[in-house]
């Protein structure tokens, strides 16, 4: 059936995880995610 693998995000620095289609940097504490990144190891849009 598959689909259970969650490949490790191989990005420089911490706090990257797959959000949307790419590995993205998560939002800092106290902020929420407005939009995920649109490139590998990119920055999410946080508010």
């Amino acid at each position: 059936q598959g689909g259970t693998r969650s490949p490790r995000c191989d990005c420089a620095g911490d706090f990257h995880k797959k959000i949307g289609l790419f590995c993205c940097r998560g939002c800092p504490a106290g902020h929420y995610l407005k939009a995920p990144c649109t490139e590998p190891c990119g920055n999410s849009t946080c508010l």
């Epitope: 598959g2 689909g3 259970t4 191989d10 959000i19 949307g20 289609l21 590995c23 490139e39 590998p40």
Partner: antibody, heavy 120, light 111 residues
Amino acid sequence: EVKLVESGGGLVKPGGSLKLSCSASGFAFSNYDMSWVRQTPEKRLEWVAAFSSDGYTFYPDSLKGRFTISRDNARNTLYLQMSSLGSEDTALYCCARHADYANYPVMDYWGQGTSVTVSS
Amino acid sequence: DIVLAQSPASLLVSLGQRATISCRASKSVSTSGYSYMHWYQQKPGQPPKLLIYLASNLESGVPARFSGSGSGTDFTLNIHPVEEEDAATYYCQHSRELPLTFGAGTMLELK
């Protein structure tokens, strides 16, 4: 066996709307990112939209506002709502599954497609 | 948008010889230690089939006569030795950013 079966295509007049469906089987649909890709009569491939497993939608700027991707995980079905259609939208529309080993969009299974013709 | 220029548009190769297909990107598709370029094969009446991902990784079940190389903006798909069943159109695709784009395709014909 992974199967993706598209339906809903047909002949539509310029300015019209159409909703395409893609029925998925043979894999855990809800765990996968999915895309719609179209193939023009000149055989060019164009990415149309994507819906990630965690609920985000993505479009090329050129189609944003006219096309809407959605999914029903309970029905294992991906949809594409298309509006304000023009002759440039004439194509074979395929749904594609993104590979689950990848943290980037690459498509490892494709459906045969459903044909959309925009003409008066 | 990243434009992918494939060459040649068509290729005539003898059985057992080498086929080389090029894909050039309008900007680098390499970042974070990876090259986000992928290759597909499409036979008439069939949907595309993934051959190679991240420039050089062979998809499961794809014969070892297919290989990919390159980084930055220049990428190559090699088929050696070419077999009859390899007659098809080959497309490159990047996932360096959105929107995803594809090359225009290279049609491989056998002599």
